[in-house]
């Protein structure tokens, strides 16, 4: 071409009719005018659909690729059963990496880039309808859904997309039910759906399969009041529409079937991308024909990337953008409602949000009020945990009933049968057996069931844990264990147990208002202060006692000798007086001991001057010894008490852990989480982690057996234990104040009523009564200010 001639860029198209080919040529002319054609001139080359795949592939080669087309537009074939007519176009052009722009093709398979590697489209796939369903769920606050999908690529794609969206909202379908495409019997599947709590049914199926589902649903009375049917476009088209129930909500892609509008927008996108592409360097021309040509178009992948990143704001069909799969983003849908066999637009999805027109909607059963979306199951699965005094677990009698017992008030203890592992000790085989549960939480459950009109079956948590998030197989994925895990997985509908309300749990489940306010405290063994019989020896060391004992006898002997042999001893003032006898050895002993033990000596004192001097020195020494001993004895008796009790969470023995002082809590409990989360308690946590117990009962026993010096746990439980087991005592101030709440899933229909019922129970004194009955009654004398007593131990 001459230097001043524009570059000719051929654009190919496979369209439904000659009329559409004419529209395509007009759109190309419009694009040339819009961009100015002095540099680049677009040229339209088109064919209509061929009756079979081989002819279609040949036509693409002979009529389009031979013209060196930069891109090929392809509409969906007019025959509804000939689903894969764009496939030969996609395969043939894709082989050479020539981008293909689908105009009205909605099947999700075309999003698979490993199969359709050069395919983009100006419409979204059917699976993207999941985004609209998800948004409708949000707008109408429907959290309980049943997903009914055909077990084919389309159904699985819709399911995957919806599940991903639900996961982001930390939610999930109550049940996903799959059926084989073309099946004629879905009754059993729908029967299963009917048993569930959810009443919002989302259906993804072909026209014919949808018709089968609707017929079966009508027979099972699943299309009347209370139900919601959310479907896509295929499910309210053709044969499906004949059987669809009134009140169904379906979707229609706005301009979805408007081939001429999509031709216009696709040409606009291609024109914009061509101009962008040709500004880049090293652009090669597309292949000319297929015969003998196996080389890909080198610039093809680059052109596809340019197309995919295009933003065409002023399209006839709205804003045209593509996602990473080449599918149209921000598509607009009409929300259609079947009323009296007619489809009525009752809302819009504008690419991001649903704008409903509630005035126009008629719900199944002719209702004008939005259905709740669930039926409240009145039989609830309750999970609990053995934790006295909140939940006692005892074996059943031989006849399978529970032994009759009475509370401290003389009322019969209310017991319920609860199934659960018969032994929680590690290593022993665990069998699920019926047992008897009773206690604070069981009384509360019975009260709630009565006021809120539900029945229940109680089971003990299988792993014996309250619930923490743990990594799965060292991956980054975390899963809840314990009662939390059972609630979230649907094995339980409600946790009725002393479950601590904390932020981490509250992100995933709904807590009721607290039924018990408490905190953490520390349980230690009560050391009764005792003094042993030999404690009077303690003020002096044994060497000193030995020296004192020796001194007594040495002094006595010295006195005896001095008194016996001193020449002064014989000096008489008055010779008439009878001569006094010198000290005998025994009286010298008597004198020596007497002085030491401070007894008044009436006779047998030394007579000689020298002996008396020694006696005075000894008396002085004795006075010092006795005074020292007395003072020390008093001090020792005062100090002869056990090591000072833990003062609280800030006690140095806790803050500076050592193996001499072992403290712990229960593994994977809220206390465990608390210590793990608090940075300033990290040293404590590292110590505790090594010593934590499987259950509170085991830890309490360990304290009693002196294997554990301190057990950190819920104050309500520990205060109760200390009041029952007289060798235990709680110590220190409460810390990490919290409460126990009843746990429910976020979407639980019971959550408001449970909280209201608990608040009423606080107001009317019921909780106070439970507290008196189960938690606050005393078995032990709580006073611990007795003086040290002497014992024979």
């Amino acid at each position: 071409r001459a230097a001043c001639d524009p570059k000719i860029v051929n654009i190919g198209a496979v369209l439904s009719t000659r009329k559409h080919e004419q529209m395509f040529r007009e759109a190309v002319n419009q694009a040339n005018k819009r961009h100015g054609s002095w540099k680049i001139q677009l040229n339209a080359t088109s064919v209509t659909h061929k009756p079979n795949a081989i002819q279609m592939a040949l036509s693409v080669c002979e009529d389009l690729i031979s013209s060196q087309v930069y891109a090929i537009l392809v509409s969906h074939p007019p025959t509804p059963n000939d689903h894969f007519t764009p496939t030969p176009v996609s395969y043939t052009a894709g082989f050479y990496r020539i981008p293909v722009l689908g105009l009205t093709t909605r099947m999700s398979i075309y999003s698979d880039k490993s199969i359709h590697l050069s395919f983009l489209r100006t419409v979204p796939p059917y699976s993207h309808q999941s985004s609209v369903w998800f948004e409708m769920m949000r707008v109408y606050s429907w959290n309980h859904i049943i997903l009914l999908v055909s077990d084919d690529h389309e159904g699985r794609a819709a399911q995957k997309r919806l599940e991903t969206l639900l996961e982001e909202r930390e939610s999930k379908a109550e049940k996903v039910l799959q059926f084989d495409p073309g099946t004629k019997n879905v009754t059993a599947l729908l029967m299963e759906a009917k048993e569930l709590e959810a009443r919002v049914i989302i259906l993804s199926a072909s026209e014919d399969d949808a018709a089968t589902v609707y017929r079966a649903a009508a027979m099972l009375n699943m299309t009347g009041s209370g139900y919601v049917w959310l479907v896509g476009e295929r499910e309210i088209s053709g044969n499906a529409l004949r059987y669809a129930p009134d009140g169904i909500l379906g979707l229609q892609l706005i301009n979805g079937k408007n081939e001429s509008a999509h031709i216009s927008d696709a040409v606009g996108v291609v024109a914009q991308a061509v101009h962008e592409l040709l500004e880049k360097e090293n652009i090669t021309d597309p292949p000319r024909g297929c015969v003998g040509n196996t080389n890909i178009w080198k610039t093809g992948p680059l052109f596809k990337r340019v197309l995919m990143s295009s933003k065409y704001a002023d399209g006839v069909t709205g804003r045209v953008e593509f996602n990473e799969d080449g599918d149209r983003k921000f598509a607009n849908y009409s929300i259609m409602n079947l009323q009296n066999r007619k489809l009525v637009q009752v809302g819009i999805y504008n690419g991001t949000h649903v704008i409903p027109n509630d005035r126009k909607i008629i719900w199944p059963g002719g209702e004008t009020e939005k259905p709740r979306g669930y039926q409240m199951s009145t039989r609830l699965k309750i999970v609990t945990i053995h934790q006295e005094p909140f939940v006692y677990v005892k074996p059943t009698l031989s006849d399978g009933t529970c032994k009759e017992e009475f509370t401290v008030n003389g009322d019969p203890v209310k017991k319920v049968i609860c199934t659960g592992p018969n032994d929680t000790s590690p290593g022993s085989p665990r069998h699920t057996v019926p047992q008897c549960c009773y206690g604070f939480c069981i009384d509360l459950l019975i009260k709630l069931a009565r006021t809120m009109n539900f029945t229940y079956e109680v089971h003990l948590v299988a792993d014996g844990k309250f619930g923490t998030q743990e990594r799965v197989n060292n991956s980054n994925k975390k899963e809840w264990n314990g009662m939390m895990g059972e609630l979230l997985s649907g094995q339980a509908d409600m946790i009725v147990a002393p479950l601590t309300i904390n932020n981490e749990r509250a992100q995933y489940i709904e807590f009721s208002k607290p039924f018990k306010y408490q905190g953490l405290t520390i349980l230690v063994k009560k050391e009764i202060p005792r003094s042993t019989l030999d404690s009077f020896m303690q003020p002096f060391q044994s060497t000193l006692w030995l020296l004192v004992g020796l001194s007594v006898h040495v002094v006595a002997v010295m006195l005896y000798l001095l008194d016996r042999f001193s020449p002064f001893g014989r000096f008489k003032v008055n010779s008439e007086e009878e001569e006094e006898d010198a000290l005998t050895l025994s009286s010298a002993m008597w004198f020596s001991w007497g002085v030491l033990l401070n007894s008044g000596i009436g006779e047998g004192a030394p007579r000689s001057f020298s002996a008396r001097i020694l006696g005075m020195v000894w008396a002085g020494f004795a006075m010092i010894i006795v005074a020292s001993y007395t003072a020390n004895l008093a001090a020792f008796l005062v100090l002869d008490r056990p090591e000072e009790r833990i003062t609280g969470i800030n006690d140095p023995r806790l803050r500076n852990p050592s193996d001499k002082f072992i403290y712990a809590t229960v593994k994977q409990s809220s206390v465990d989480i608390y210590f793990r989360r608090q940075v300033e308690l990290s040293t404590m946590y590292r110590h505790m982690e090594k010593h934590n117990y499987e259950s509170a009962a085991e830890a309490i026993q360990a304290v009693r057996d002196n294997k554990l010096h301190a057990f950190i746990w819920d104050s309500a439980v520990l205060e109760f234990e200390a009041s029952q087991k007289c060798d235990l005592v709680t110590t220190g101030e409460l810390f990490f104040r919290s409460g126990f709440g009843i746990g429910m899933r976020k979407d639980s229909p019971w959550k408001q009523n449970v909280s209201l019922s608990i608040l009423k129970s606080h107001e009317n004194g019921f909780m106070e009564d439970l507290d008196k009955t189960w938690v606050r009654y005393q078995e032990c004398d709580s006073r611990s200010n007795a003086p040290a007593t002497l014992t024979f131990e």
């Epitope: 009323q339 009296n340 007619k342 489809l343 009525v344 637009q345 704008i355 027109n357 005035r359």
Partner: antibody, heavy 119, light 107 residues
């Protein structure tokens, strides 16, 4: 062919109740569609008053709500409008019309009846 | 309530002229709009529904377009029998409201 025909007194005294009836021929009012009353004061624009649906449910303009009663007589294939406590401002041509709710439009209209409120 | 602002309120055009009447709702009505023609002393007659669809029996010179909050009724070639008042009306929310009307006259 569907036809709608309004009937009722042409003159109503202030504070009294205006009563109008729309007779429908060529289509059963219980089969489908929404059946409306619309009015047009002399020389002014159109104002929607109320509708009754094929299933008997109804709705009316909030600005008139506490004065409007809409009902139907299925045996005569008629629907009626009662507007209480009328004033001179209620003087208008009253039309009945059929709404094709699927296409969101009034596709059939009666020829209208003028009601004057005056003492 | 959604307010419907119609413009112009009146216009004069010659036979064969292209005439456009616009209607602007106070909020998005998502193409839930109808156009009516009312001749003096007569009931209104449906011309266009759902913003762009021509009602049965309406001449093809009438067309509707628009979306969101901007709608247009176009008469491609004005005929003498088109002399009337034209009303737009939304059906999105309750209550459905009408524009104040555009009176079309022949020059």
């Amino acid at each position: 062919q569907v036809q709608l025909q309004e009937s009722g007194p042409g003159l109503v005294k202030p504070s009294q109740t205006l009563s109008l009836t729309c007779s429908v021929t060529g289509y059963s009012i219980t089969s489908d569609y929404y059946w409306h009353w619309i009015r047009q004061p002399p020389g002014k624009g159109l104002e929607w008053i109320a509708y009754i649906r094929y299933d008997g449910r109804n709705d009316s303009n909030p600005s008139l709500k506490n004065r409007v009663t809409i009902s139907r007589d299925t045996s005569k294939n008629q629907f009626s409008l009662k507007l209480s406590s009328v004033t001179a401002a209620d003087t208008a041509v009253y039309y009945c019309a059929r709404e094709d709710y699927a296409s969101s439009s009034f596709d059939y209209w009666g020829q209208g009846t003028l009601v004057t409120v005056s003492s | 309530d959604i307010q419907m602002t119609q413009s112009p309120s009146s216009l004069s055009a010659s036979v064969g002229d292209r005439v456009t009447i616009t209607c602007r709702p106070s909020e998005n009505i998502y193409s839930n709009l109808a156009w009516y023609q009312q001749k003096p002393g007569k009931a209104p007659k449906l011309l266009v529904y759902a913003a762009t669809n021509l009602a049965d029996g309406v001449p093809s010179r009438f067309s509707g377009s628009g979306s969101g909050t901007d709608y247009t009724l176009t008469i491609s070639s004005l005929q003498p029998e088109d002399i009337a008042t034209y009303y737009c009306q939304h059906f999105w929310d309750s209550p459905p409201t009408f524009g104040q009307g555009t009176k079309l006259e022949i020059k």
